[in-house]
C-alpha cells in the first residue's frame, strides 16, 4: 500500500452523561486510515495534569491501513479547559501534523445557520464606493462562537469588535459586518464568513454576480446520425452553444476524447441571432469504429461570461436494442388538390432513439428538405416512434408510382436499414382512390395499444381499429380508414390506412 496520512477525530462523551461530581474524566483522539506505522500522539493539557495512554495500532481489514486511539485522563477543573491532541505522521512527511482542539464533553446543541447578505446597488444599478457584507449567524444554542472572514480562502484582518449577539428565547444570533472597497468587490474574489462553534465549522461564501446574466448560455452535443454512421460511413458530432453574448469571438470550443487519443480537425461556424446573441457550432468528424466501440467525446466551452467552463460529453447509447417497424401510407385525394398527395411513414418500436429517415423515388434519395420528420417520441412500451411526411406531385407519381420510406437504425439487420414502398394509386378493389370520395374519419380508441390499419390492400384492419360506417354515396364498405390517436393534451396525429 502507498503512504497515507491519517484522519484525526476527537472522542468525547456527552456532557449530560458525566456526573457533576466527577473528579477526573477521559477523552480520546482517533487517528485512522494511515500507512505505514507509526503515528505519534501528544497532548496539550494547558495548566492541568493528565495521564495519556496510546493503544496499539490495529489494522483496518479492507484497506490494510492502520488505526490507533490515544486516551487522556485529566483531573481538576477540566470543565472549562480546552485540550489539544497533536498527531504526527513522519512517513507522510517530516512535518506532517494535525491538531484537534476540543473540550472534555459535547453538549446537545442547535447548530447555527450562516448567511451572508450584501448591500444593494444604487438606483442606477451601479456599485457604490463601498460594499457591506453582513454575516448572519442565527438560531444556535448560546455559547462561544468565533467568526472569521476569508478572502479567496485567506484570513482577513477584520475588526470583529462590531459583531453583536442577541438572544431570542433559547437560541442566539450574532452578526458581523465586513466593509469592502468597490475595487476589492469588483475583483471577482470570493468572501467567506467562517464560524467556529462547539468544535465545528460553518460557513457561507459570496462573490459579485456576473455583470449581466448571460441569458442562460446552453451547450448541446449531438450524436452522429445513423445515416452518417452506417450509410455514408463518415460520422460527425456537433457541439452547439446558444445564447452567447457575442464578445467578438472569444468563445472557445475544445474537443477531447476520454481515451486521451487525439481528435480530428473540427469545423466551426458562428451565427448571429436576432436576439443579439451568438450561436456557435463546432463539428467534429469521428471514427466509425471508435464510435461503435463506445469512445466518449467531450466538448469544452469557455467564454468570458461563463463563471466556469461548460463540459458536454457524448457516447454511443447503451441499453437494449430493437429494430424499427416501418409502415408507409398514402392519403386519399383531397378536394381541390388533385395534383398533390401526402405520403406518411410511421416508424415505431425501435431502440435506442437515434434514427435517420429517408425517402427515395426512382432509386434516388430525395433531399431532406422535401420531407418533415418528427423527433423520436416514446411509445407506450419501451421503444420510440417517429412520423415522416412527404408531399409528392402528380408528375412524380406518373413518372413512377413507387416511393420508398427508409429507416436507418443500428438494430436493423442486415444492413442497418428497413424500408417500405408506398404507391399513390395502389389499385384498390371498388375503384381507385382518386375517383372515390374519402370516407368519414374513424376515431380509433384502442385502450392499451393503438391499433394500426394494415398497409396491404384488401387486408382487414387491426381488431382495435374498426372501419367507419361508410357513407351513403360510398360504394360498398369503405376501403380507406383514418385512424386518429388523441394524445392527452396534444394535437392528435393521424394516418391513413387500408381496412
Amino acid at each position: 500500500a502507498s503512504t497515507q496520512s491519517p484522519s484525526v477525530f476527537p472522542l468525547t462523551r456527552c456532557c449530560k452523561n458525566i456526573p457533576s461530581n466527577a473528579t477526573s474524566v477521559t477523552l480520546g483522539c482517533l487517528a485512522t486510515g494511515y500507512f505505514p506505522e507509526p503515528v505519534m500522539v501528544t497532548w496539550d493539557t494547558g495548566s492541568l495534569n493528565g495521564t495519556t495512554m496510546t493503544l496499539p495500532a490495529t489494522t483496518l481489514t479492507l484497506s490494510g491501513h492502520y488505526a490507533t486511539i490515544s486516551l487522556l485522563t485529566v483531573s481538576g477543573a477540566w470543565a472549562k479547559q480546552m485540550f489539544t491532541c497533536r498527531v504526527a505522521h513522519t512517513p507522510s512527511s517530516t512535518d506532517w501534523v494535525d491538531n484537534k482542539t476540543f473540550s472534555v464533553c459535547s453538549r446537545d446543541f442547535t447548530p447555527p445557520t450562516v448567511k451572508i447578505l450584501q448591500s444593494s446597488c444604487d438606483g442606477g444599478g451601479h456599485f457604490p464606493p463601498t460594499i457591506q457584507l453582513l454575516c448572519l449567524v442565527s438560531g444556535y444554542t448560546p455559547g462561544t462562537i468565533n467568526i472569521t472572514w476569508l478572502e479567496d480562502g485567506q484570513v482577513m484582518d477584520v475588526d470583529l469588535s462590531t459583531a453583536s449577539t442577541t438572544q431570542e428565547g433559547e437560541l442566539a444570533s450574532t452578526q458581523s459586518e465586513l466593509t469592502l472597497s468597490q475595487k476589492h468587490w469588483l475583483s471577482d474574489r470570493t468572501y467567506t464568513c467562517q464560524v467556529t462553534y462547539q468544535g465545528h465549522t460553518f460557513e457561507d461564501s459570496t462573490k459579485k454576480c456576473a455583470d449581466s446574466n448571460p441569458r442562460g448560455v446552453s451547450a448541446y452535443l449531438s450524436r452522429p446520425s445513423p445515416f452518417d454512421l452506417f450509410i455514408r460511413k463518415s460520422p460527425t458530432i456537433t457541439c452547439l452553444v446558444v445564447d452567447l453574448a457575442p464578445s467578438k469571438g472569444t468563445v472557445n470550443l475544445t474537443w477531447s476524447r476520454a481515451s486521451g487519443k487525439p481528435v480530428n480537425h473540427s469545423t466551426r461556424k458562428e451565427e448571429k441571432q436576432r436576439n443579439g446573441t451568438l450561436t456557435v457550432t463546432s463539428t467534429l468528424p469521428v471514427g466509425t469504429r471508435d464510435w461503435i466501440e463506445g469512445e466518449t467525446y467531450q466538448c469544452r466551452v469557455t467564454h468570458p461570461h461563463l463563471p466556469r467552463a461548460l463540459m458536454r460529453s457524448t457516447t454511443k447509447t447503451s441499453g437494449p436494442r430493437a429494430a424499427p417497424e416501418v409502415y408507409a401510407f398514402a392519403t386519399p385525394e383531397w378536394p381541390g388538390s388533385r395534383d398533390k398527395r401526402t405520403l406518411a411513414c410511421l416508424i415505431q418500436n425501435f431502440m435506442p432513439e437515434d434514427i435517420s429517415v429517408q425517402w427515395l423515388h426512382n432509386e434516388v434519395q430525395l433531399p431532406d428538405a422535401r420531407h418533415s420528420t418528427t423527433q423520436p417520441r416514446k411509445t407506450k412500451g419501451s421503444g420510440f416512434f417517429v412520423f415522416s411526411r412527404l408531399e409528392v406531385t402528380r408528375a412524380e407519381w406518373e413518372q413512377k408510382d413507387e416511393f420508398i420510406c427508409r429507416a436507418v437504425h443500428e438494430a436493423a439487420s442486415p444492413s442497418q436499414t428497413v424500408q417500405r414502398a408506398v404507391s399513390v394509386n395502389p389499385g384498390l378493389a371498388g375503384g381507385s382512390a382518386q375517383s372515390q370520395r374519402a370516407p368519414d374519419r374513424v376515431l380509433c380508441h384502442s385502450g392499451q395499444q393503438q391499433g394500426l390499419p394494415r398497409a396491404a390492400g384488401g387486408s382487414v384492419p387491426h381488431p382495435r381499429c374498426h372501419c367507419g360506417a361508410g357513407r351513403a354515396d360510398w360504394p360498398g364498405p369503405p376501403e380507406l380508414d383514418v385512424c386518429v390517436e388523441e394524445a392527452e393534451g396534444e394535437a392528435p396525429w393521424t394516418w391513413t390506412g387500408l381496412c
Epitope: D211, P214, P246, S247, T250, K272, Q273, G276, P304
Partner: antibody, heavy 119, light 107 residues
Framework: QVQLVQSGAEVKKPGASVKVSCKAS????????ISWVRQAPGQGLEWMGW????????NYAQKLQGRITMTTDTSTSTAYMELRSLRSDDTAVYYC????????????WGQGTLVTVSS | DIQMTQSPSSLSASVGDRVTITCRAS??????LNWYQQKPGKAPKLLIY???SLKSGVPSRFSGSESGTDFTLTISSLQPEDFATYYC?????????FGQGTKVEIK
C-alpha cells in the same frame, strides 16, 4: 458606475510611436472586450481594433495591421493601444470603448485622447 | 466590409419637431445595428442597440426601427439637448463600420 478614463493628449513627430491608456472601473474588466475607435478632425468614426480582456485575443482593422498593438493589464484593469510609424493622417481623437453584451454595441466610451502628429 | 450610408448628412429642425434619420446597410446585417449621439468635443454615447432596443437611461423620445437593410432613428419631439451628430454602426460582421453621421442643427 462604468467608467473608462484615458491618458492625456500627445504631440508626436511623424515616424514616432504613441501609447494611449484606458483605465476601466465599475465592472469586471475581464468580462468584456475593449475596442479602439478614432475620429480625425471634422470626420466620422473609424474602428481600429479590439482586444479581449478575458484572454488577450486581438482583432485589428486591416489598414492598421503591422502598426498597431493592443494589450491589457488585468491587475490594473487597463487597456493600451500603441500605434507606430505615425503619419500626419493619424492625427485624431482616439477613443476606447467597452463592447456591450448583446448585439456588440460600444456601450461605454472613454473621454478621448487627442494625438497630434506634426513635424 | 459592410458600407453604412446615412441620410441626410445634416438637417435643421426646431425644438418639438419629429426628426427621422435613416441608415442603409450594403448587405444584410439582421438587426445588429446601433445608434450613437455625439456632441462637439465629447465621446459618442450609445442610444439604441439591436436596431430598436433603448439603452437604459436614454429618453423614450428616441426610438429605432428596421425594414430589411434600412434602419431608422426617430426623435419624436426634439429637445434642446438633442442637437448633435448621430451615427449608425453595424456590429454584424468584423470590421464594425459606422455611417458618416447626420448633424442635427437648430433651425
Amino acid at each position: 458606475q462604468v467608467q473608462l478614463v484615458q491618458s492625456g493628449a500627445e504631440v508626436k513627430k511623424p515616424g514616432a510611436s504613441v501609447k494611449v491608456s484606458c483605465k476601466a472601473s465599475g465592472y469586471t474588466f475581464t468580462s468584456y472586450g475593449i475596442s479602439w475607435v478614432r475620429q480625425a478632425p471634422g470626420q466620422g468614426l473609424e474602428w481600429m481594433g479590439w482586444i479581449s480582456a478575458y484572454n488577450g485575443n486581438t482583432n485589428y482593422a486591416q489598414k492598421l495591421q503591422g502598426r498597431i498593438t493592443m494589450t491589457t493589464d488585468t491587475s490594473t484593469s487597463t487597456a493600451y493601444m500603441e500605434l507606430r510609424s505615425l503619419r500626419s493622417d493619424d492625427t485624431a481623437v482616439y477613443y476606447c470603448a467597452r463592447d456591450g453584451d448583446y448585439y456588440d454595441p460600444f456601450d461605454y466610451w472613454g473621454q478621448g485622447t487627442l494625438v497630434t502628429v506634426s513635424s | 466590409d459592410i458600407q453604412m450610408t446615412q441620410s441626410p448628412s445634416s438637417l435643421s429642425a426646431s425644438v418639438g419637431d419629429r426628426v427621422t434619420i435613416t441608415c442603409r446597410a450594403s448587405q444584410s446585417i439582421s438587426n445588429w445595428l446601433n445608434w450613437y449621439q455625439q456632441k462637439p468635443g465629447k465621446a459618442p454615447k450609445l442610444l439604441i442597440y439591436g436596431a430598436s432596443s433603448l439603452k437604459s437611461g436614454v429618453p423614450s423620445r428616441f426610438s429605432g426601427s428596421e425594414s430589411g437593410t434600412d434602419f431608422t432613428l426617430t426623435i419624436s419631439s426634439l429637445q434642446p439637448e438633442d442637437f448633435a451628430t448621430y451615427y449608425c454602426q453595424q456590429s454584424y460582421s468584423t470590421p464594425p463600420t459606422f455611417g458618416q453621421g447626420t448633424k442635427v442643427e437648430i433651425k
